[in-house]
C-alpha cells in the first residue's frame, strides 16, 4: 500500500494576512487565524513529517481584500510560489479582471500548474493562452505518479468576466476523456481538483469513471468528523464518501474558505491505484500555529503599498453621499442607490442576445451602510472613505430567488419599521411601495422589478412564481438581519466580489458621481 497526504485550500479570496475568526480584518492578533505565513508553518511541518505530500488549491484565490485590488493577482502568484503549491484549479473569480488579468499576473508567473479541463479557448486567445493552463497534470510524488485533473464552474460567464473566447463546458462531459487519457498513460491515481461547488463535486465523484478523490471549492463547504474546532457547522463528515456508479467509494473534500483551515486528507492506495482507505480533517489555522517569520516579513514588505493606496483618490462626488442610519434605515438613501448601482454595474454580462443583462435587481440592508461621505472635501473619495461605509469585508453575491421569497423579504424589511433597525432594504432595479398603516407582513402594496429579457428595460409587477436573479450582500444570502427566508428559500447562491472593491471600481469608472434619491422606495401613507 502507498499513502498520499493531500493538503488543500479553496476560496482563499485574498486573505494573505491573518484574519479575525469571521475572516474579516484581524484586530486582536492573539485571536487571529489563517494567513499565508501561518499556512506555510503548518504545511512545512507536515512536509517534514510525511513522505508523500501534495499541496493543492481548488480556486478563487482572487478577489476579497485590498490585496487583490492593488496587486491584481501578482500577490497570489508570489505567495503561492513561496508556499510551493503543487497545483491549482481555476475558479470563477480568477476571471474577475478579464482573461488578461489572469494571464499576466498569475498564469505566466505561477511555478505550479494551473488546471481546468472544461475551459476551452477559441479564436485568437487559443494560441495566446496555450500551455498556460492545462486540463491535467501528472506529478511525481515520492516514487509514484498522481494525475490531477481540473475543472471550473460552467456558470463562470455569469459570475465573472472570462470574455467571449473561452467556452465553459459541462464538467463531467469534459473530465471523462481527460481521465480516460490519464488511464491510457498508465496513471492509476487520479485527483479531480476543481471549483464548481459541493453538489457538482459529488456528481463528479459519482459519474466520472477513474477519479479516485475529489478536492473541491466554490460553495465554501465545511466538512468535519468529530467536534468542530470553531464556529463553522459541518455540512457532513470529512471526507464525504460518495459511492460511484461503478461501485467505488470516492472521498470528496472541501476546506471552508478564506484560508481559515488547511484541508488534510490521507489516502491509502493499493498497487493498482485503488483507494483502500481515506481519513483526515481540516486543520484550524489558529494562533497556536506560529506565523513563519520569513513569509511574514515578506507580507509586511508587500503591505506598504496597500497603506499608500488606501488614501489615493478613486473619483469624486459632487453630492453628499447620505449613508447615515437616520436615512438608510428609514427611507431611500442615495448611498444605498450608489452601492446598488455599483453592484448591478459589476454584474453586467451580455451572455445572451435575448437579455440586456442576466440580472437587474439589487437589495441591500440599510444597516450594512455604516457611514456617509461628505462632498465638501473637494469631492474626493478614497478607499479609506469606502472602508468606513462598508467596514465588514463582505461580498456582493448573486442569488436566484422566487418572487414569493422576494415579497417576504420586502415584508421583513418593514415589519418593525421605525426602530432604526438594519433590515430596511435599499434597492436597485426595484420600485417598492409600502403602506405602513397595514399590519406587519402585509405592508408591501406595490413591487415592480426591472425586466431583464427586454431590449428597453422597464418595470413590471413581480410575479410570485417566477425565478429572479438578485445581487445582494453575502450577509443577506446567509440569512443575516433576520432574512431567514432568503437563506432557506434561495435556489442558487454564488459568492461575488468584495463589497468595497465593487463600489471603488464603479466610482473609478464613473470618475464623477451624483446619485440621487429618485423614488425607488415610496410610502403610500401621507406621513412619509
Amino acid at each position: 500500500a502507498w499513502e498520499l497526504t493531500i493538503l488543500h485550500t479553496n476560496d482563499v479570496h485574498s486573505r494573505l494576512e491573518q484574519t479575525s475568526e469571521d475572516s474579516s480584518k484581524c484586530v486582536n492578533a492573539s485571536r487571529c487565524m489563517g494567513g499565508v505565513a501561518r499556512l506555510f508553518t503548518k504545511v512545512q511541518q507536515i512536509r517534514r513529517a510525511e513522505p508523500n505530500v501534495l499541496l493543492l488549491d481548488a480556486g478563487d484565490q482572487y478577489q476579497g481584500t485590498i490585496w487583490f485590488t492593488v496587486y491584481k493577482g501578482a500577490e497570489v502568484a508570489h505567495f503561492m510560489n513561496a508556499l510551493r503549491y503543487d497545483a491549482m484549479a481555476l475558479g470563477n473569480h480568477e476571471f474577475d479582471n478579464g482573461v488578461e488579468g489572469l494571464i499576466e499576473p498569475l498564469l505566466k508567473e505561477a511555478k505550479f500548474p494551473i488546471l481546468s479541463a472544461n475551459i476551452k479557448a477559441k479564436g485568437p486567445l487559443a494560441s495566446q493562452i496555450s500551455g498556460l493552463y492545462l486540463p491535467y497534470k501528472v506529478l511525481p510524488v515520492g516514487d509514484e505518479v498522481v494525475g490531477i485533473v481540473g475543472y471550473t464552474s460552467k456558470e463562470t460567464p455569469f459570475l465573472s468576466n472570462p470574455g467571449t473566447n473561452l467556452v465553459f463546458e459541462d464538467e463531467i462531459t469534459a473530465l471523462q476523456p481527460e481521465v480516460d487519457k490519464l488511464k491510457t498513460l498508465n496513471v492509476n491515481k487520479i485527483i479531480a481538483l476543481g471549483h464548481s461547488g459541493f453538489e457538482m463535486d459529488k456528481l463528479i465523484a459519482q459519474k466520472v469513471r477513474g477519479v479516485d478523490v475529489v478536492v473541491g471549492g466554490h460553495s465554501n463547504t465545511f466538512l468535519y468528523t468529530g467536534n468542530p474546532p470553531s464556529k463553522e457547522v459541518p455540512a457532513g463528515k470529512y471526507p464525504f464518501i460518495v459511492t460511484s456508479d461503478d461501485g467505488r467509494k470516492v472521498p470528496v473534500v472541501q476546506a471552508y474558505a478564506f484560508g481559515k483551515y488547511l484541508g488534510y486528507l490521507k489516502i491509502e492506495f493499493d498497487e493498482r491505484g485503488n483507494v483502500i482507505s481515506s481519513h483526515g480533517n481540516p486543520i484550524l489555522l489558529n494562533s497556536s500555529i506560529p506565523e513563519d517569520p520569513s513569509i511574514k516579513a515578506d507580507i509586511n514588505k508587500w503591505r506598504i503599498k496597500l497603506d499608500n493606496y488606501s488614501t489615493q483618490e478613486l473619483g469624486k462626488t459632487i453630492v453628499y453621499l447620505d449613508g447615515s442610519s437616520q436615512s438608510c434605515r428609514f427611507r431611500e438613501c442615495n448611498m444605498g442607490n450608489l452601492i446598488c448601482d455599483a453592484m448591478i454595474n459589476n454584474n453586467l454580462r451580455h451572455t445572451d442576445e435575448m437579455f440586456w443583462n442576466h440580472v437587474s435587481m439589487c437589495i441591500l440592508n440599510g444597516g450594512g451602510i455604516r457611514s456617509p461621505i461628505d462632498e465638501r472635501n473637494n469631492g474626493t473619495i478614497t478607499w479609506e472613505n469606502l472602508a468606513a461605509v462598508l467596514p465588514f469585508g463582505g461580498t456582493f453575491d448573486l442569488v436566484q430567488l422566487k418572487g414569493s421569497t422576494l415579497k417576504k423579504a420586502f415584508e421583513h424589511s418593514v415589519h418593525r419599521y421605525g426602530q432604526s433597525t438594519g433590515e430596511f432594504l435599499q434597492v436597485g432595479g426595484i420600485h417598492v411601495v409600502y403602506d405602513l398603516s397595514r399590519k406587519p407582513g402585509d405592508r408591501v402594496v406595490k413591487l415592480d422589478v426591472l425586466c431583464t429579457k427586454c431590449r428597453v428595460p422597464s418595470y413590471d409587477p413581480l410575479k410570485m412564481d417566477e425565478v429572479y436573479k438578485v445581487i445582494l450582500p453575502n450577509f443577506l444570502a446567509n440569512g443575516g438581519d433576520g432574512f431567514q427566508m432568503i437563506k432557506d428559500e434561495l435556489l442558487r447562491h454564488d459568492s461575488g466580489d468584495q463589497d468595497i472593491n465593487v463600489v471603488s471600481t464603479y466610482i473609478s469608472k464613473m470618475k464623477v458621481i451624483y446619485p440621487a434619491v429618485e423614488g425607488r422606495i415610496k410610502f403610500s401613507t401621507g406621513s412619509h
Epitope: 500548474p113 500551455g131 497534470k137 501528472v138 511525481p140 515520492g142 516514487d143 505518479v145 498508465n186 498497487e271
Partner: antibody, heavy 119, light 107 residues
Framework: QVQLVESGGGVAQPGRSLSLSCAAS????????MHWVRQAPGKGLEWVAL????????YYADSVKGRFSISRDNSKNTLYLQMNSLRAEDTAVYYC????????????WGQGTLVTVSS | KIVMTQSPATLSLSPGERATLSCRAS??????LAWYQQKPGQAPRLLIY???NRATGIPARFSGSGSGTDFTLTISSLEPEDFAVYYC?????????FGPGTKVDIK
Amino acid sequence: QVQLVESGGGVAQPGRSLSLSCAASGFTFSDYGMHWVRQAPGKGLEWVALIWYEGSFEYYADSVKGRFSISRDNSKNTLYLQMNSLRAEDTAVYYCVRDAQWGSRLDYWGQGTLVTVSS
Amino acid sequence: KIVMTQSPATLSLSPGERATLSCRASQSVSRYLAWYQQKPGQAPRLLIYDASNRATGIPARFSGSGSGTDFTLTISSLEPEDFAVYYCQQRSNWIFTFGPGTKVDIK
C-alpha cells in the same frame, strides 16, 4: 511505427560542449517522458537523464549533474541533451529512449549516436 | 544511491535449457524493476517491467519475478536468438540504475 533518431554525436575536446538531438515520430511525443541512456565502449548501460512529458521535471545521474541539461520541444517532437564541460569518461553511445510508464517501461530505444571526448 | 548487482556475470547454456538470471538491489526498490536484452551492435530491448509484466511482443518463455531487493529473470527454454546480454534496471526517487549485466552465451 515508433522511431527515435539521434544526431549530433562526434568528437569533442575535454572541457568543451556538444549538443545531441533526438527526432521522434510515430507517437504523440508530448504524452511521454523521455530519457537519455549511454553506453561506454564495451561497458554496460548507464542512465543519464529523464525529462517529464511536458518538460516540467528533470532528473539527472550524479555523474552528469550540473554539466548536462535535458530539454525538449514538443512542437518539434524533439528531445535534446546539452553536454557541457565534457570529460573523457563521457565517451559513449548515447541512446534516446521513450518512457511508456513513468520510469517503469523504457520501451523504445533509438540506435544511438557516438560521442567521443578526446584531446 | 542504490547499487544493482547481477549474477552470474556469464551464464553458459545450450539452446532448450532453462536460464535463471538474478538481480539484487542494495535496498528495496518495491516493484520498480525492469529487464532488458541487448545484442551486439544493437540498442537494448525491453523484456519485463514492474518486475513481472512482459512487454509488448515478448515471447511467453520470458518471465520475471521478485520484489523488494531480489529479482529473477527466467527464460524457460533458450532459443538461439536469446543469447545476448541481459540488464536489470531499477528506479528509486526518479534516479535510475542498471545492473552490470549477465551475458548468456552458448555452451
